[in-house]
Interface confidence: low
């Protein structure tokens, strides 16, 4: 049973804290560091031995609306000759991020935090070999 | 979540933008909890561009613990288990959204913050710069 909870009750509440209804929290969605840019090496998705493609998912009831997902292009890895080597495996690397979900319930709107699993890229691994007796 | 009544008449027109401040439920909905992988994995060790995980802890943030990947080698591990410097291990970075307590130390008041994390490493062919 996983019940991810955000607010730990042991935090000493300063006088300046805004009043919040029970069971909820106030969330300012003006993003800190909004204009920060990823400084990854150029075109690593194409130059990797476990290359991947990107697709953009879009949902107007999610904030942010755009989430980019990677998909490994191959099951195997690309060797020095540019051929796929199926003795190795391309595997996805994933990371969780938070999004805000807007839900319509009749004529009302509610907001819910949600964890989204993002595939960030792929890496080449030695496979786990299962020996059958 | 916390229900916010809409204007009387309940117009069909969809709000294009999210309000700047919203009230949300303390419980985080996790759509991935149903996935039940049969075995655990250790890609960080088995990768040809292996990485170590470094703990980044900040009680004013949720999640309070984030793990940063640091590539172990400049090169990649070849079939013989040696580091091949003709290839490069590079970090895969991702922008993620976290919650920052604002004002500080408040238990139930947050602001979204974008942070850059290195999630793992991948092996790439290097960009060779030919000098004229």
């Amino acid at each position: 049973r996983k019940i991810p909870k955000v607010g730990h009750t042991f935090f000493q509440k300063p006088e300046s804290c805004p009043p919040v209804p029970g069971g909820s929290m106030k969330l300012d969605i003006g993003i800190i560091n909004e204009n920060q840019r990823v400084s990854m090496s150029r075109n690593i998705e194409s130059r990797s031995t476990s290359p991947w493609n990107y697709t953009v998912t879009w949902d107007p009831n999610r904030y942010p609306s755009e989430v980019v997902q990677a998909q490994c292009r191959n099951l195997g890895c690309i060797n020095a000759q540019g051929k796929e080597d199926i003795s190795m495996n391309s595997v996805p690397i994933q990371q969780e991020t938070l999004v805000v979900r807007r839900k319509h319930q009749g004529c009302s709107v509610s907001f819910q935090l949600e964890k989204v699993l993002v595939t960030v890229g792929c890496t080449c691994v030695t496979p786990v070999i299962h020996h059958v007796q | 979540g916390i229900t916010i009544p809409r204007n009387p008449g309940c117009p069909n027109s969809e709000d294009k933008n999210f309000p700047r401040t919203v009230m949300v439920n303390l419980n985080i909905h996790n759509r991935n909890t149903n996935t039940n992988p049969k075995r655990s994995s250790d890609y960080y060790n088995r990768s040809t561009s292996p990485w170590n995980l470094h703990r980044n802890e900040d009680p004013e943030r949720y999640p309070s613990v984030i793990w940063e990947a640091k590539c172990r080698h400049l090169g990649c591990i070849n079939a013989d288990g040696n580091v091949d410097y003709h290839m490069n291990s590079v970090p895969i970075q991702q922008e993620i959204l976290v919650l920052r307590r604002e004002p500080p130390h408040c238990p139930n008041s947050f602001r979204l913050e974008k942070i850059l994390v290195s999630v793992g490493c991948t092996c790439v062919t290097p960009i060779v710069h030919h000098v004229a």
Partner: nanobody
Framework: EVQLVESGGGLVQPGGSQRLSCTAS????????MGWYRQAPGKQRELVAL???????DYADSVKGRFTISRDNSKNTVYLQMNSLRPEDTAVYYC??????????????????WGQGTLVTVSS
């Protein structure tokens, strides 16, 4: 998957002592926070005590000076030593943990997990 298993509940006399323990199992990389919450009949679940990976601890005001939380990182276990127990301490005690772990190639950071709960009854 991560499991939390509590033990040590039972019937105790007022003024008596009891020790609860909780062990986390699974493919755990690191445990950030472990702790105890309790829920008395008809009441909300409330924090009892938490202990961080660095060893620092936090307690609810109602148990300060009476309860002590500790952990054994090598065993992924957290303990709650409860002294000078009072009838109002009667509750189901739940172990909680924020754990980073690998599962199926995915790294899950700071997932909150809960045990099934162990009943502590303080009565003469």
């Amino acid at each position: 998957e991560v499991q939390l298993v509590e033990s040590g509940g039972g019937l105790v006399q007022p003024g008596g002592s009891q020790r609860l323990s909780c062990t986390a199992s699974g493919t755990i990389v690191n445990i950030h926070v472990m702790g105890w919450y309790r829920q008395a009949p008809g009441k909300q679940r409330e924090l009892v005590a938490l202990i961080f990976s660095g060893g620092s601890a936090d307690y609810a005001d109602s148990v300060k000076g009476r309860f002590t939380i500790s952990r054994d990182n090598s065993k992924n276990t957290v303990y709650l030593q409860m002294n000078s127990l009072r009838p109002e301490d009667t509750a189901v005690y739940y172990c909680a943990a924020e754990i980073g772990y690998y599962s199926g190639g995915t790294y899950y950071s700071s997932e909150a997990h809960w045990g099934q709960g162990t009943l502590v009854t303080v009565s003469s």
